[in-house]
Amino acid sequence: ALDTNYCFSSTEKNCCVRQLYIDFRKDLGWKWIHEPKGYHANFCLGPCPYIWSLDTQYSKVLALYNQHNPGASAAPCCVPQALEPLPIVYYVGRKPKVEQLSNMIVRSCKCS
Amino acid sequence: ALDTNYCFSSTEKNCCVRQLYIDFRKDLGWKWIHEPKGYHANFCLGPCPYIWSLDTQYSKVLALYNQHNPGASAAPCCVPQALEPLPIVYYVGRKPKVEQLSNMIVRSCKCS
């Protein structure tokens, strides 16, 4: 699986999950989140050559098409597969509120 | 929706479904499929700016991150959303066999 265990410990050039830290204030302009100040969101990057973690029948066909037509602009793309939530704390007035933000952290990628 | 109805009738530059015809023999090297000789597989292409058909919380965050950090390599990617099957006919000896191939045709795209 193209997950953090594999990708963070390898020098994989093809589609894999990469490290990305997002600072809520600096990178998103969100000043209202109290905790955390930012988080390891990660992102997916890398080419999707033939047979590389292909998602559907279509992505297999497209990768094979790409192999036969190397100059074509039609190619599978490296995108998130498994996403995890992130708990945040923010204030409503003086009252802290804990919220679970779904699908915030990329754990693995796929070629789609 | 970034589907064939909208995308094929517009000059949309952002993420949209594009026309692509795949010839089984020439483009994939599959000589054994009798009918059809090829099919309109389509593909997804175009940038994914902030708020453009974003798939998850994460892709919204990433598009916003990208807006704040224009040089970054982390950005959502335009990929298939709705896929449709394709019926094919091939011969097993002299006997024709009809098979429904799942997830073969792109009907719409999303930013993931």
């Epitope: 029948q57 066909v61 094979l64 | 000589k31 054994w32 011969y91 097993v92 000896g93 002299r94």
Partner: antibody
Amino acid sequence: QVQLVQSGAEVKKPGASVKVSCKASGYTFTSYWMNWVRQAPGQGLEWMGQIFPALGSTNYGEMFEGRVTMTTDTSTSTAYMELRSLRSDDTAVYYCARGIGNYALDAMDYWGQGTLVTVSS
Amino acid sequence: DIQMTQSPSSLSASVGDRVTITCRASESVDWWGNSFMHWYQQKPGKAPKLLIYLASNLESGVPSRFSGSGSGTDFTLTISSLQPEDFATYYCQQNIEDPLTFGGGTKVEIK
């Protein structure tokens, strides 16, 4: 060059299952049908079935239907043949063989080295 | 199923001999202008090797002393001048009908 490398010999008890692997290299794995053929000791060749790796489409010989499953892992270009409810008359050398590509059922131009499966109590 | 009958089941021959092996199918294997009949060679302990496909087409890398002919139900594999490396078992195979079937084999031995 095209190569099909099969897993090693197996000894199984009657009623058990066996899974033989066949790793392909030197060609586009998803563009050709992969066949499985067996040969009992001193006997002729018997076709078991086939699979098209890109689509997972299968055709099984009637004699093996319900007892055999053919699968592939396109990420490793490997084909698998699992035979269940083994009997002593399943003792044979099992071959994977690539179809030449013009039809589903076809001549077979490249063969694995064979895997001997012995079924004995 | 289409039955494939090879004859003879074995034969003895000398180096330089012309050898002919026949294969008869229980029904015609002709379709779409092709004869769906193929020939293989197998040596002891080895996998079969494709010699001839579609009745008369020589597989790449196979010596030209091997040739195939026939149509309908009757087919022939000919070795024009037998060489020491040709001593082996030969099989015919049809693919016009599911299941794909092989002949029982012809063993070519040294006289």
